[in-house]
Structure formats: structure tokens, C-alpha cells
């Protein structure tokens, strides 16, 4: 299986002045003796060989290298130097790659389980011998390092003094390329197909493709405006409308097949237009409205759908009142005209100065339609007066008005004089005759139940919990900022998000350390240490492994004897003093009168028999939050995640090198930076617009619609470029018009119209 | 060399319940995408479903979800499909299938296929 | 989910003839269309990835192409061995889906 990350060893130095072995023989000589005249000059091969494993506060060199382990070819002989770790030394092992060559120093250690961030490196030098396998002998250093190291690019340098060489090296701990978090245990591959479609940001989130959403990715985003309750899509900018549904944006409902006056809310009706009805809205409810069929004055009484009935006037009947009985009696003639009765009813001949049917008809002078331009005319008795409409003057309506004196545009760059009319030319945002409409541009584009606000020459969508963007289509990844401390896995929920912590973690950020020494899994009588996510035990001397539970073999060396005081005369060291084993390897013996004895302690042990490790602890010398381990005349501290040195008191600022953006301002936290945006910036290196669209993004009249992290201008007639910068028209490129104004090109020659404020020829 | 080995297939009751397995050697198996595909006697391919071992993604075919199960043990580095539920019409040769995946490319294509198992669905 | 149409269904052809196959979806799949080969009785083969990439080992008789909606394999002089039924998929989005074959035989 592929490994979730790699420890890295970089030997960069060596120096074994004298070229001899651990046990002070020489490399090369026989017999392994030191000679009298030291050891001659590079008689060593010199290898080495790393072991990986859990922490140890006592490092034991046996046992297992739980973590792993690697070796080196013979890098050189009593000392040598290699490139060290970081930029310079990667070009150099650069150039011996590119020549063929191995990193000769480098050793490369995979694991495949989660990092537990605290470990044990043992390194040892060796002289490489031809004929025999490693054993004690060849060993010319062994030095070990315990502590803790996070996954990150950067180089760890470690300094060793042994007892014969000393050792130059650096160390790091790297994730494989698709696993993130301080742990590497947190997987993310990016892929493109119907898993998902996404990259991984530098915490191993996914981030969605353009066209894609949702936490996975796999959600396709669809066409802009598209109502997602009628409608849906499974690839980017479709529109695929749910059965019962049409239109480009699924907003419009299919009627029942076959109906003609009627409409729907919900698909499948025929809710009827006024005065129709029937299933297909096609019985028409008024037959006398739309057809009058009553003549001669009768009177029409709508009956059944497309039935009606006449009620005539005097004189008159049929079906329609079409048929005349004595028409003259009612003297319909007007006037002093002579009615005759004909068959159809009656016939008036009038007298001079009067027509019509009735002779009900003033023949005047406005018969021939004098008033010119949709005049209208008054007949008098004298003659006639035309009533002009606003655009013309003059006896006859024949003289243009100058509509533009009256200032008749509201939200207009200018207003020109046409013949019978005026043109305003509406800023964007505006229409009707006057401009003074205000354009609705809500429609439907808010999406996920978004509430639309019309601005001019725009809108704005009010967003439910959840979601963002400029049409609510992104839902809000909580899970964006990385919220979740302690190599937690974050998932997003449509309310907010929730945090998966690792064993260790608790909270609603995993920021909690659960205390792992409660109860204590120390056997043994052992003392627990917590940890960040894992914990401690200080095996006493006779107990071992994780838990101390391994028991240790008390008397390496063989059975115990009894002893009489000290059992040893008094040595060199100190007057009545002794190193017998009563006082074990930490104290000194001295017999008193009677076989008895007393121990002399060495620094930082205490008892009887100078067996207890006086705890360096008890004052609590860590700082914030730093976990203490005592050791022999000294402690360590384990810093929490932000923390480092050796009391846990440097916070490294997080601020360098500066990762805001756009003028931003950091802030240094622990283990974290914020980032104080200007105006008009968000995210969390304040590198996104708040809002891509302003009143200036796009030019000549252009629209500005805003997607997220990015615009697009709709440009109008005769204008291109991501601004509507550029004109089609020759005349207008490039724009001569200065402080947005609009170019207006004829042939070679423009013209320029200024937004308010500004004047002259190019705006200027 | 790449290798997919399936097993389990067999006779089985309507509404009854198997399990398959898909043994893979010869690749890194957490790099890949593993998918079931099966073919009805006489007819065409039909896709199950399928898994990301590296992180545990599955996804099913509208006609086996509910019913089928897909997971897998990277230790062991094997696949399982576990069908419960089964009707006549599941019957058919399931084959195992790896797909290599990278965001450069869409439709990388299931370059191995294991030899197939049967399974009949009757009573 | 995705359809994927295949034509013809079958066909009948000469050893070195060319034949072309094409593959229609019921939606936009961008490039993600694979083409396999299956002989009676074993696993298919994969021939072509990405609408348009030979896979490693496949005869460069054998081509594909198309995007969004439409697709083709094309075999440019058929030979013995490629009497076979063959198979278009997408992988893009939803759940994969293969088309209905298309059985090529000997004339």
C-alpha cells in the first residue's frame, strides 16, 4: 500500500578525528588494538544506519524499530561532508541526480499510519567491513534524539557530540502528495469525473471545479437563474425542466393540453381568462362584448356560453333587430331630415350641412383632416382649430417642438430633439420614454429560496443560512476556513459544520485535549503524563514498553548477591567510599560501623538507594499548556500545536512571511494568523472580492454580473472586451472617452457622452 | 503483473444474499478506483457501482442502491460487493474492474478487468 | 442518469474495411468516453480513454474522437481479430453508464 508520508534523514557531516571505533580500537587494525601512535589516517568505511520509533523518554538502542528503518552506503572514511538539507543542498543533490547519482546521505523512511508527531531516532555509525556481518564491533558511534516534529517542508538540524564522532544532521517529516493535517492521515486526490470533480486546497479539503458544488463536488451547478424547484441539472449550465414544466429556467408551467383563454400556476390547469370558460377556457361568456350582433339599437343579453339574446327597440325585430315595422313613426331623422321607410327600416335624406344615418352628423371643415402630425381638429362655425400633440406647434401641427427645453429625461446621459419627438438615452438601469422606469432585474436568479432586492441596473440576493454568492448557488463551505484543530476532519452540514476529532481530541473544534490519563492506562505504579492527543508513562526502573507493563530483567549481568555493607573496601574515589551495585548506577556507597551503609547520591537522585529520579517537574516549568516529562537531573517540555522552546514560551509569528493579501492586515494567534481585510476583500488571506461588481466595473453601459470570485460583463451594441472597453466601431478604438464616458462612433469621426460631472470632448 | 481475481459467485435464492470478492495484486491499490460492472446473459454492460479505497467514496447505480453493498480492506487489498435483497434480474457475470483516475484527464477507463463470476438469482 | 445511444447495432464488414461506430449521450459528458472491446466469453478490453487516447498496447488502427455529445471509434483497416462486440461508456457525472454495443461481423 502506498505510504501516507515519509521521515527523512539528512546526514550532512561526520567528523571521526581519530578513525576510530566505540570500543577505541582502530577501523583498520588488526585485531581491532589501538596502536600506540593513534590510528592512521581514513582507515574507516564509514555507513550509517537509522532506527525509527515510538517516543522514549530513555531511549533504550535495542528493540525494535517500530516506525522503521534505513542505512547509507559508505559516504567516506573517518569524516566527510554532504550538502546539507535545504535550498542549497537540494541543488546540489539536484545536479547529482540529474548526473545519475543517488543522495548519497539521504535516508527516507515511509510510513503508513497516522504520524503520532512524538518518536525516537537512533543513528549509528558504522565501518564497513567486507567479510563480516555488522556486529558490536564495527560500531564506531550510536547517538539518539527523542522529541516531537510535524509535517512540514522545512529541515530540523540536529547536533551530536559522541564519544568518538561527532554527527551533523537534519531531519523533517513530509506527507505524501495526497494526504494533509499534522497527522497525514487526512486523504485527498484530485479527480475529475462522476466521484467528484475538485482539487485539494493546502489542508486536504476539496475544492470544488468551476460548474461543481457540494461536499463532494459531484453537484453540478446549473444554468444561472434556473429554478432549481422545477428544475435541475446533472452537468454545469443546464437547465432540464421537471415534468410539467418549460422554459429556459423551468419557471413556466405547461396548461392543459388543448386550452385556448387560459393560463396555469401549477401545470396542467386552464384557469380562464375573463369572460371565457368551459375545460379548455373556449366558450366565450360575453358573445355580446366581442361580437355586438344587436342592431338598430336593440339591446344585448349575454345567455349561455357563445348564446345571446336581442331585445329590440320599437319598431324593430328579428334575432339581431335587423327587421324594420313602421321606422319612420319615432321621427329618427334629425335635423329637419325627411324620413322614407324601406325594407330594411328607414332611409333620412338631410338637409344641407348634415350626414349620417340619423342626420345626426355636422359635415364641418375638419372633414378633410387638416391637422398634420396626429393633430386634432375642432370644428367651429367659422372654421376649425387643431389641438397639437406635444412634439408640434403651428395653425396645421406642421412645426416641430423642441421637447427638450422641458428637461423631460429623468435618468438620461442626454436628450435629443427628433423630428415629432425627442430620444432620451437612458443610463444603465433605466427605461421608458422619460427613463424614468427602473429596470426589474430580478428574475428568478436568486436561487435555493433566495430573496431578490432590485438596485439600478442590478440586484441583489439575500442569501438563507448556508448559502452564499452573488445568486446563492455556493453553499457556504463551513469547513473552508479549516475550523477544526488537532488534525480534526471537518464536515459540512447545511446548518454550519461539525468536527470529527482523533482519539485524544474533544470539543466542538476538537480543541479540547481530553486528559488520556484519566484513568490512568500507566500499570505498574507508573506516572502518566498527557499528552497533545497521546500520553506518557514513566516506567520505573523494573517496568517497560507503552504502558509499562513489560517487566525488565532486574540483574542483567546475572544472579544477585547478598551484601554486607558495602561489600568492597573503600575505593579511590572518596575517603570509605565504594561503587558497589547496593546503590545502583546512580550513587555511591559508604560503609559505616556494624555493616551497615549509607548511599551518596548523584545529581538530581535521591532514597536509600539513590534509585528516585527527583522530579524536575514539580515546579511546573512549562509554559502554556506545555506538557513536562522529567528526566535525569532535567525535564522536557512537549509544547502544544503554536507553541515552541524549550519552556514552551516562543510563539512563532505565523505572520512571516506575510500571507494577506490585497493590503490586508495580519494579526499573529497561536498556530494561526488573521488577516483584517480592506474594504471590498474577503477570505481568509483577504483574497477575494466581497463584491467583483461596482457601478465602474463595466464601461459603456455594460452589466456586471458577479460570480463569486470573478465578473462578467454583458456588453451592449458595439462594445467588446472583458470591460466593454473596446469598441467594434474603428472610430471608438481605443476609447477616447475619459472618466466613463461612452464613445459613440461614426465612421472616422466620434462623439462622447459625458457622465454627470464631467464635459468636453473626450470627458476630460 | 496487474491482477484481479473475483469469487463468490453462485446459485442463490430470490431475496436471498452474497457476498463477492475482487483479490488485486501487482499495483499500488489505494491509487486506484475499483468498480463492479455485470453482464446479464446475452446482454450488454451494466455498471454496479463503485469504490475510492484510498478514502472510502462508493457510489451505485440506481437499480442496486440499498441492496448493494461495496467496501473494501486496503490490508488485505481486496474488494467486496455484498448484494442482499437479490432478484432474478441480478442475474449475470460480475466482473471487478480497476480505474486509474487524474484531475488532467476525464474518462481514464477501466484498464483491468478480473475473468468474472456468475451469480444466479432462482428458485 | 445518462444515456449513452450507440449505431449501429450491428454491422457486417470485410477484413480491411473501415468501420466506424458512434456513440451519442443524452447530455454534455466533456471528454469522458471510453471505448471497449469484448469478445464472447471474456472481459472486455479497454481501447480507447478520453474520447480520443490510444491505451498502451492497442493497435494504432484503432481511434477515437468527439466531445460534448458526440463520439466515434474508428477502425481504420479491420483485421481477423477485431471481429468483436464493442462498447462506448461515460464516467463524467452521475452514475456511469455504457452504451447498448455494437456487434461487428464478418461479411
Known amino acids: 500500500a502506498r505510504p501516507m508520508g515519509y521521515f527523512e534523514l539528512q546526514l550532512s557531516a561526520l567528523r571521526n578525528v581519530n578513525g576510530e571505533l566505540l570500543s577505541g580500537a582502530c577501523c583498520d587494525g588488526d585485531g581491532r588494538t589501538t596502536r600506540a601512535g593513534g590510528c592512521g589516517h581514513d582507515e574507516c568505511d564509514t555507513y550509517v544506519r537509522v532506527c525509527l520509533k515510538e517516543y522514549q523518554a530513555k531511549v533504550t538502542p535495542t528493540g525494535p524499530c517500530s516506525y522503521g528503518h534505513g542505512a547509507t552506503p559508505v559516504l567516506g572514511g573517518n569524516s566527510f561532508y554532504l550538502p546539507p538539507a535545504g535550498a542549497a543542498g537540494d541543488r546540489a543533490r539536484a545536479r547529482a541526480r540529474a548526473g545519475g547519482d543517488q543522495d548519497p546521505g539521504l535516508v527516507v523512511i515511509p510510513f503508513q499510519f497516522a504520524w503520532p508527531r512524538s518518536f525516537t531516532l537512533i543513528v549509528e555509525a558504522w565501518d564497513w567491513d567486507n567479510d563480516t556481518t555488522p556486529n558490536e564491533e564495527l560500531l564506531i558511534e550510536r547517538v539518539s534524539h527523542a522529541g516531537m516534529i510535524n509535517p512540514e517542508d522545512r529541515w530540523k538540524s540536529l547536533h551530536f557530540s559522541g564519544h568518538v564522532a561527532h554527527l551533523e544532521l537534519q531531519i523533517r517529516v513530509r506527507c505524501d502528495e495526497n494526504y494533509y493535517s499534522a497527522t497525514c492521515n487526512k486523504f485527498c486526490r484530485p479527480r475529475n469525473d462522476f466521484f467528484g470533480h475538485y482539487t485539494c486546497d493546502q489542508y486536504g479539503n476539496k475544492a470544488c471545479m468551476d460548474g461543481w458544488m457540494g461536499k463532494e463536488c459531484k453537484e453540478a451547478v446549473c444554468k444561472q437563474g434556473c429554478n432549481l424547484l422545477h428544475g435541475g441539472c446533472t452537468v454545469p449550465g443546464e437547465c432540464r425542466c421537471s415534468y410539467g414544466w418549460q422554459g429556459r429556467f423551468c419557471d413556466e408551467c405547461v396548461p392543459y393540453p388543448g386550452c385556448v383563454h387560459g393560463s396555469c400556476v401549477e401545470p396542467w390547469q386552464c384557469n380562464c381568462e375573463t369572460n371565457w370558460g368551459g375545460l379548455l377556457c373556449d366558450k366565450d361568456l360575453n358573445y355580446c362584448g366581442s361580437h355586438h350582433p344587436c342592431t338598430n339599437g336593440g339591446t344585448c343579453i349575454n345567455a349561455e356560453p357563445d348564446q345571446y339574446r336581442c331585445t329590440c327597440p320599437d319598431g324593430y325585430s328579428g334575432r339581431n333587430c335587423e327587421k324594420a315595422e313602421h321606422a319612420c313613426t319615432s321621427n329618427p331623422c334629425a335635423n329637419g331630415g325627411s324620413c322614407h321607410e324601406v325594407p330594411s327600416g328607414f332611409e333620412c335624406h338631410c338637409p344641407s350641412g348634415w350626414s349620417g344615418p340619423t342626420c345626426a352628423l355636422d359635415i364641418d371643415e375638419c372633414a378633410s383632416n387638416p391637422c398634420a402630425a396626429g393633430g386634432t381638429c375642432v370644428d367651429q362655425v367659422d372654421g376649425f382649430e387643431c389641438i397639437c400633440p406635444e412634439q408640434w406647434v403651428g395653425a396645421t401641427c406642421q412645426l416641430d417642438a423642441n421637447e427638450c427645453e422641458g428637461k423631460p429625461c429623468l435618468n438620461a446621459f442626454s436628450c435629443k430633439n427628433l423630428i415629432g419627438g425627442y430620444y432620451c438615452d437612458c443610463i444603465p438601469g433605466w427605461k421608458g420614454i422619460n427613463c424614468h422606469i427602473n429596470v426589474n432585474d430580478c428574475r428568478g436568479q436568486c436561487q435555493h429560496g433566495g430573496t431578490c432586492k432590485d438596485l439600478v441596473n442590478g440586484y441583489q440576493c439575500v442569501c438563507p443560512r448556508g448559502f452564499g454568492g452573488r445568486h446563492c448557488e455556493l453553499e457556504r463551505d463551513e469547513c473552508a476556513s479549516s475550523p477544526c484543530h488537532s488534525g480534526g476532519l471537518c464536515e459540512d452540514l447545511a446548518d454550519g459544520f461539525h468536527c470529527h476529532c482523533p482519539q485524544g481530541f474533544s470539543g466542538p473544534l476538537c480543541e479540547v485535549d481530553v486528559d488520556l490519563c484519566e484513568p490512568s492506562p500507566c500499570r505498574n505504579g507508573a506516572r502518566c503524563y498527557n499528552l497533545e492527543g497521546d500520553y506518557y508513562c514513566a516506567c520505573p526502573d523494573d517496568f517497560g514498553g507503552k504502558n509499562c507493563s513489560v517487566p525488565r530483567e532486574p540483574c542483567p549481568g546475572g544472579a544477585c548477591r547478598v551484601i554486607d555493607g558495602c561489600g568492597s573496601d573503600a575505593g579511590p574515589g572518596m575517603p570509605g567510599t565504594a561503587a558497589s551495585g547496593v546503590c545502583g548506577p546512580h550513587g555511591r556507597c559508604v560503609s559505616q560501623p556494624g555493616g551497615n551503609f549509607s548511599c551518596i547520591c548523584d545529581s538530581g537522585f535521591t532514597g536509600t538507594y539513590c534509585h528516585e529520579n527527583i522530579d524536575d517537574c514539580l515546579g511546573q516549568p512549562c509554559r502554556n499548556g506545555g506538557t513536562c516529562i522529567d528526566e535525569v537531573d532535567a525535564f522536557r517540555c512537549f509544547c502544544p500545536s503554536g507553541w515552541e522552546g524549550e519552556l514552551c514560551d516562543t510563539n512563532p509569528n505565523d505572520c512571516l512571511p506575510d500571507p494577506c493579501h490585497s493590503r490586508g492586515r495580519c494579526y499573529d494567534l497561536v498556530n494561526d494568523f488573521y488577516c483584517a481585510c480592506d474594504d471590498g476583500w474577503k477570505g481568509k488571506t483577504c483574497h477575494s472580492r466581497e463584491f467583483q461588481c461596482d457601478a465602474y466595473t463595466c464601461s459603456n453601459g455594460g452589466t456586471c454580473y458577479d460570480s463569486g470570485d470573478t465578473f462578467r460583463c454583458a456588453c451592449p451594441p458595439g462594445w467588446k472586451g472583458s470591460t466593454c472597453a473596446v469598441a467594434k466601431n474603428s472610430s471608438c478604438l481605443p476609447n477616447p472617452c475619459v472618466n466613463g464616458g461612452t464613445c459613440v462612433g461614426s465612421g472616422a469621426s466620434f462623439s462622447c457622452i459625458c457622465r454627470d460631472g464631467w464635459e468636453g470632448r473626450t470627458c476630460t | 503483473e496487474v491482477q484481479l481475481v473475483e469469487s463468490g459467485g453462485g446459485l442463490v435464492q430470490p431475496g436471498g444474499s452474497l457476498r463477492l470478492s475482487c483479490a488485486a495484486s501487482?499495483?499500488?491499490?489505494?491509487?486506484?478506483?475499483i468498480h463492479w460492472v455485470r453482464q446479464a446473459p446475452g446482454k450488454g454492460l451494466e455498471w454496479v457501482g463503485g469504490?475510492?479505497?484510498?478514502?472510502?467514496?462508493?457510489d451505485y447505480a440506481n437499480s442496486v442502491k440499498g441492496r448493494f453493498t461495496i467496501s473494501a480492506d486496503t490490508s488485505k487489498n481486496t474488494a467486496y460487493l455484498q448484494m442482499n435483497s437479490l432478484r432474478a434480474e441480478d442475474t449475470a457475470v460480475y466482473y471487478c474492474?480497476?480505474?486509474?483516475?487524474?484531475?488532467?484527464?476525464?474518462?481514464?477507463?477501466?484498464?483491468?478487468w478480473g475473468q468474472g463470476t456468475l451469480v444466479t438469482v432462482s428458485s | 442518469d445518462i444515456q449513452m445511444t450507440q449505431s449501429p447495432s450491428s454491422l457486417s464488414a470485410s477484413v480491411g474495411d473501415r468501420v466506424t461506430i458512434t456513440c451519442r449521450a443524452s447530455?454534455?459528458?466533456?471528454?469522458?468516453v471510453a471505448w471497449y472491446q469484448q469478445k464472447p466469453g471474456k472481459a472486455p478490453k479497454l481501447l480507447i480513454y478520453?474520447?480520443?487516447f490510444l491505451y498502451s498496447g492497442v493497435p494504432s488502427r484503432f481511434s477515437g474522437s468527439g466531445s460534448g455529445t458526440d463520439f466515434t471509434l474508428t477502425i481504420s483497416s479491420l483485421q481477423p481479430e477485431d471481429f468483436a462486440t464493442y462498447y462506448c461508456?461515460?464516467?463524467?457525472?452521475?452514475?456511469?453508464?455504457f452504451g447498448q454495443g455494437t456487434k461487428v461481423e464478418i461479411k
Open positions: 469504490i475510492s479505497p484510498a478514502d472510502g467514496d462508493t
Open positions: 478520453s474520447a480520443s
Open positions: 461508456q461515460q464516467s463524467y457525472t452521475s452514475a456511469p453508464t
Open positions: 474492474a480497476r480505474n486509474d483516475y487524474d484531475v488532467r484527464t476525464v474518462g481514464s477507463g477501466m484498464d483491468y
Open positions: 501487482g499495483f499500488t491499490f489505494t491509487s486506484y478506483d
Open positions: 447530455q454534455d459528458v466533456s471528454t469522458a
